[in-house]
């Protein structure tokens, strides 16, 4: 394991009043090599709803780096390379679990958190609202 | 907190050989607003690369239910509703963290695991391999 200095301001796991706290082993199963989605496929470039990947970095969170997709266009790319604004590029979102250091900077103490990330984009037919 | 009897077969958090282990407060914090945007879009139906959601259930994992996207077609749906096989519907994958009890039934001990899930589908231009 890694030797971690005890920070006096950090919670003590033996403290009976500490909220429902458990030990979590971070030796992750299934450590897939690539964490950068650009390496695993080039769909972000070849899609009719292409997206850019933005690095969201937070040292107080595990994983500290998360890639967020931002659709490049409002519309979708046609075969000729032009954008069709009768269609919409939209982000596909996924709720994921992360660990956040709490209190901040305490190396050994985290809180489970759910966050919403945009994974990629898809091309959809718009919803047309007809005014009466 | 909840009083939990120590199970003799469960790891001891003070054990120096216990793999990189941290304390985690499991009162899940949800960074999203009260309504859950991950659940509220019907893109899976409106996309040019529509998908079905299949239940992946594992009672020994949190979350116990994860939804896997399976693209409905090999090709992409055109404006007239027909499938264009010159384009490809492909799954967008995301690596997510889940919690697993380890050893099983030890109330205070978990292991973090990475799994790869298909979140939705996008329509891409195929890679054409020209034979010399």
């Amino acid at each position: 394991g890694i030797a971690i200095p005890r920070n006096s301001g950090c919670p003590n796991s033996e403290d009976k009043n500490f909220p429902r706290t458990v030990m979590v082993n971070l030796n992750i199963h299934n450590r897939n090599t690539s964490t950068n989605p650009k390496r695993s496929s080039d769909y972000y470039n070849r899609s009719t709803s292409p997206w850019n990947l933005h690095r969201n970095e937070d040292p107080e969170r595990y994983p500290s780096v998360i890639w967020e997709a931002k659709c490049r266009h409002l519309g979708c790319v046609k075969a000729d390379g032009n954008v069709d604004y009768h269609m919409n590029s939209v982000p596909i979102q996924q709720e994921i679990l992360v660990l956040r250091r709490e209190p901040r900077h305490c190396p050994n103490s985290f809180r489970l958190e759910k966050i919403l990330v945009s994974v990629g984009c898809t091309c959809v037919t718009p919803i047309v609202h007809h005014v009466a | 907190g909840i009083a939990i009897p120590r199970n003799s077969g469960c790891p001891n958090s003070e054990d120096k050989n216990f793999p990189r282990t941290v304390m985690v407060n499991l009162n899940i914090h949800n960074r999203n607003t009260s309504t859950n945007p991950k659940r509220s879009s019907d893109y899976y139906n409106r996309s040019t690369s529509p998908w079905n959601l299949h239940r992946n259930e594992d009672p020994e994992r949190y979350p116990s239910v994860i939804w896997e996207a399976k693209c409905r077609h090999l090709g992409c749906v055109k404006a007239d509703g027909n499938v264009d096989y010159h384009m490809n519907s492909v799954p967008i994958q995301q690596e997510i963290l889940v919690l697993r009890r380890e050893p099983r039934h030890c109330p205070n001990s978990f292991r973090l695991e990475k799994i790869l899930v298909s979140v939705g589908c996008t329509c891409v231009t195929p890679i054409v391999h020209h034979v010399a």
Epitope: - | N27, S40, S41
Partner: antibody
């Protein structure tokens, strides 16, 4: 096969509290939540709140916030729902249900709570 | 809260009939809609989850469809054991149920 077995019927006075139990037999709670849903006589179903026994995390419907407490004891695979400051409108059948956070797939048999002076 | 409105509130039908119950959500809920069957004095039973997926052990005469705000439960050929009350329920947000539809013998 998961079975949820609830405690027996209760008769309570207005202003008092009731605590209903729900025991998971044929397996542990696993990682699912346990939700509590009530049904007043001749009425529809109303979700009250839930707990994830693995974590102790609770989520309550706004209507019951401050009046309901949901707990779980993993060592006995039992969840509890305590409702305080009872009034006659709380007369209902109270159900526990296994909650995948998407649907309720296993239900207890129900516990009738009658609030009467 | 998301409001769920079922129609009709009751329906009289005969064995062998095709019965359709509709459920409307006050806002879009994607496909996060479930259908339950409840018989008098019994707990509800999950029939359909995620709008159209049949729960294991449920007869195939039950089917669900819809997305967004409008959903339908169909019983293709009503059987004697199907006379019951049916509830829709959303899980896009904190769960809420429709008011129920009672399927009665004609």
């Amino acid at each position: 096969q998961v079975q949820l077995v609830q405690s027996g019927a209760e008769v309570k006075k207005p202003g008092s509290s009731v605590k209903v139990s729900c025991k998971a037999s044929g397996g542990t709670f696993s990682s699912y939540a346990i939700s509590w849903v009530r049904q007043a006589p001749g009425q529809g179903l109303e979700w009250m709140g839930s707990i994830i026994p693995w974590f102790g995390t609770t989520n309550y419907a706004q209507k019951f916030q401050g009046r309901v407490t949901i707990t779980a004891d993993e060592s006995t695979s039992t969840a509890y729902m305590e409702l305080s400051s009872l009034r006659s409108e709380d007369t209902a059948v109270y159900y526990c249900a296994r909650d995948s956070e998407y649907y309720f797939d296993h239900w207890g048999q129900g516990t009738l709570v009658t609030v009467s002076s | 809260d998301i409001q769920m409105t079922q129609s009709p509130s009751s329906v009289s039908a005969s064995v062998g009939d095709r019965v359709t119950i509709t459920c409307r959500a006050s806002q879009g809920i994607s496909n996060w809609l479930n259908w339950y069957q409840q018989k008098p004095g019994k707990a509800p039973k999950l029939l359909i989850y995620a709008a159209s997926s049949l729960q294991s052990g449920v007869p195939s005469r039950f089917s669900g469809s819809g997305s967004g705000t409008d959903f339908t439960l169909t019983i293709s050929s009503l059987q004697p054991e199907d006379f019951a009350t049916y509830y829709c329920q959303q899980y896009s947000d904190d769960p809420t149920f429709g008011q129920g539809t009672k399927v009665e013998i004609k």
